[in-house]
């Protein structure tokens, strides 16, 4: 079988949801000594980056300027060490936001509830979309989807203090083109009678996986890279 290098990791820097006309940055983390990285969009070559010097860094950043609906979709990357190519990375879905319209988000029975109450979010947008998405701030990968012609319901069931936080919704024109975000709705969930307001609010840290962890080599990494290179030669 044809030999390949391990697959790289593809990530979006800061977020995979990019407002139209803004710049998206995708990172492809491969290996020290990779001389070329290729970014593929919907299966076709989209961009090429060559790190300088290749042995000093374990990945590259691809900048996608002026984001629009034609650049939204599935991205993957591969890299090359010498003549040897890696496997393809997993697919990354890049979404363009701030398309067309702004939905409205409401919550029933209201934004202040007690732990155990049933809560439903409603996202309304009367144009060109049938899929709606609900996101909690700081949890952008945990997207809830719901369907409706003009309005979608997001039943949360009996809530706990873990549901506290700020929510926004989007209408989706297709899987990769979303509306402007709604104004945020802050859900406040008070605990049981005996521990009311003792539970801390969820911290809204940015999504930890939405960062590019590209590193420059140290002496130890250089030794490992050299060892890896020697091993590759032996394999050849």
């Amino acid at each position: 079988p044809k030999q390949t290098l391990p697959k790289p990791i593809i990530r979006a820097e800061s977020t995979y949801m990019v407002p139209k006309e803004k710049q998206a940055t995708l990172c492809c983390q491969g290996s020290y000594g990779a001389v070329e990285y290729q970014l593929h969009f919907e299966g076709s070559l989209f961009a090429v980056e060559r790190p300088k010097p290749p042995e000093r860094i374990n990945g590259v950043k691809f900048h996608i300027p002026d984001m629009n609906s034609r650049k939204a979709g599935r991205y993957s990357c591969i890299y090359r060490v010498g003549e040897l190519w890696s496997e393809r990375s997993d697919l990354l879905d890049l979404v363009v936001t701030e398309m067309y319209d702004t939905p409205t988000l409401s919550v029933h029975p209201g934004p202040e509830v007690t732990s155990g109450e049933k809560v439903t979010f409603y996202c309304r947008l009367d144009t060109a979309t049938s899929m709606f998405l609900l996101l909690k701030e700081g949890r952008s990968r945990d997207v809830q989807r719901s369907y409706g012609k003009v309005q979608a319901e997001f039943p949360m069931g009996p809530v706990t203090t873990a549901h506290r936080g700020s929510y926004r919704c989007f209408g989706s024109y297709n899987n990769y083109a979303w509306s402007f975000p709604s104004e945020p709705v802050k859900l406040l969930v008070t605990g049981d009678i005996e521990n009311t307001s003792l539970a801390p609010t969820d911290p809204t840290f940015p999504d930890s996986w939405d960062t590019c962890l590209l590193t420059r080599e140290t002496g130890l990494q250089k030794d490992l890279a050299l060892w890896d290179h020697t091993a590759q030669n032996l394999l050849r």
Partner: antibody
Framework: QVQLVQSGAEVKKPGSSVKVSCKAS????????INWGRQAPGQGLEWIGE????????YYNEKFKAKATITADKSTSTAYMELSSLRSEDTAVYFC?????????????WGQGTTVTVSS | DIQMTQSPSSLSASVGDRVTITCRAS??????LNWYQQKPGKAPKLLIY???RLHSGVPSRFSGSGSGTDFTFTISSLQPEDIATYFC?????????FGGGTKVEIK
């Protein structure tokens, strides 16, 4: 920079049709809604309808549903509005406008206007 | 359809004056209210969107306020180049509708 350039003035006979064009440049045509409106002499503005060029989805003012047909050609970044069964009261300046980047239903760039005169 | 009633229909003021125009919606439109300026023979230009947000490149002497059904547009210090007709437009519900316009002239 963003520009919407409309076709030239038209003089038409009652009962005939006219097709007005609006060529967009300076932005991604499919990513913004194009609106059409009109302004009769000495009158205010009336909204006729709009198109989402990416999907071709239309919304019309009920008043103009039988009068106007709005289309878009993605390959040339051009929106069109055809007006049928013209009458003298259709004499007006017709505008195209891009619904703005804010997502808040405001029209941030406008064409220069096309005067349509209906006269026998 | 939502009716937009603008007043006054015309006004005359001196350079440097504060000018105020009001717009009333026939039903609640939240903050989805926009203001445009139109000079004779020209297309309208967006000045203010979502009640009070200034469109890029628009001088800060223009401002807007209000909510629900009652809205106000203000020019803090009228300049000669502000001679135009001003329209409000609701963006809450289709069909989008405009006020009848206010013609601003210099005394």
């Amino acid at each position: 920079q963003v520009q919407l350039v409309q076709s030239g003035a038209e003089v038409k006979k009652p009962g005939s049709s006219v097709k007005v064009s609006c060529k967009a440049s300076g932005y991604t045509f499919t990513d913004y809604v194009i609106n059409w409106g009109r302004q009769a002499p000495g009158q205010g503005l009336e909204w006729i309808g709009e198109i989402y060029p990416g999907s071709g989805t239309n919304y019309y003012n009920e008043k103009f549903k039988a009068k106007a047909t709005i289309t878009a050609d993605k390959s040339t970044s051009t929106a069109y509005m055809e007006l049928s069964s013209l009458r003298s009261e259709d004499t007006a300046v017709y505008f195209c406008a891009r619904r703005g980047r804010y997502g808040l239903y405001a029209m941030d760039y406008w064409g220069q206007g096309t005067t349509v005169t209906v006269s026998s | 359809d939502i009716q937009m009633t603008q007043s006054p229909s015309s006004l005359s003021a001196s350079v440097g004056d504060r000018v105020t125009i009001t717009c009333r919606a026939s039903q609640d439109i939240s903050n989805y209210l926009n203001w445009y300026q139109q000079k004779p023979g020209k297309a309208p230009k967006l000045l203010i969107y979502y009640t009070s947000r200034l469109h890029s490149g628009v001088p800060s002497r223009f401002s807007g306020s209000g909510s629900g059904t009652d809205f106000t547009f203000t020019i803090s210090s009228l300049q000669p180049e502000d001679i135009a007709t001003y329209f409000c437009q609701q963006g809450n519900t289709r069909p989008w509708t405009f006020g009848g316009g206010t013609k601003v002239e210099i005394k």
